[in-house]
Amino acid sequence: KLLQVSTIAMQQQEKLIQQERALLNFTEWKRSCALQMKYCQAFMQNSLSSAHNSSPCPNNWIQNRESCYYVSEIWSIWHTSQENCLKEGSTLLQIESKEEMDFITGSLRKIKGSYDYWVGLSQDGHSGRWLWQDGSSPSPGLLPAERSQSANQVCGYVKSNSLLSSNCSTWKYFICEKYALRSSV
């Protein structure tokens, strides 16, 4: 009988230890949740206040209609230019119209003068077709003027008010593009 009672007592004690452990875990979990909640609230508050105060484009980007453009201050090869744009949540410039081309070339004249700027245009090695980075074809008026004699991959760039082509491994400035933020006010 005594043995039975002590076994029950031991079982109860074990149960108590498990409950204490569970309570400790729960308290820890609750504390962690509270911290995460605090962090999330702070982050959202920051995001909201910066969104409220921000312009449609980030600092040092130029806006035209629904687009924001970034004109690089460094040179890089075409593939690295593409990655640099991705880091900013953008892609290499995709020119959709003559109006956009005119805006870009006009802006470049004001900013930097006559330099070379990579855009998101490349030539398929097999077919020789020019394609934008999303796979779409450029409109007839927006095809590079000269066909590069390079045996390597060929990419498109803007210079003055022309669209030209060059070996993708040459170093040039580049232009990134992303959507402008819509103002909710």
Epitope: L86, G89, S90, T91, Q133, D134, G135, K178, Y179
Partner: nanobody, 115 residues
Framework: QVQLQESGGGLVQPGGSLRLSCAAS????????MGWYRQAPGKQRELVAA???????TYADSVKGRFTISRDTAGNTVYLQMNSLRPEDTAVHYC?????????WGQGTQVTVSS
């Protein structure tokens, strides 16, 4: 830190399809774009496709019209739908997250196209 977990690789016959997935966790709010790269034996790692947090896409010339990159509504998982696969698509495919200051890589998933 951002952690990336790829899945969906495997062995497929030429002309077949595969869908790769890459799930991001950790500081996902810092990600500006996500992309897929591949590396074939003895070759350099190359960008296959990428998608920005605004949904703009970019593709390597060799996959245009065959591969499609997309993401879920939360933006934390990126998919690469690979159709009309060719033997030259055989490579380890890696997921990459782009932030303003850092790049994060997944462990990679093997894609083998062979009959």
């Amino acid at each position: 830190q951002v952690q990336l977990q790829e899945s969906g690789g495997g062995l497929v016959q030429p002309g077949g399809s595969l869908r790769l997935s890459c799930a991001a966790s950790g500081r996902v709010f810092s990600i500006n774009a996500m992309g897929w790269y591949r590396q074939a034996p003895g070759k350099q790692r190359e960008l296959v496709a990428a998608i920005t947090n605004q949904g703009a896409t970019t593709y390597a010339d060799s996959v245009k019209g065959r591969f499609t990159i997309s993401r879920d509504t939360a933006g934390n998982t990126v998919y690469l739908q690979m159709n009309s696969l060719r033997p030259e698509d055989t490579a380890v495919h890696y997921c990459k997250a782009f932030t303003r200051t850092d790049d994060y890589w997944g462990q990679g998933t093997q894609v083998t196209v062979s009959s």
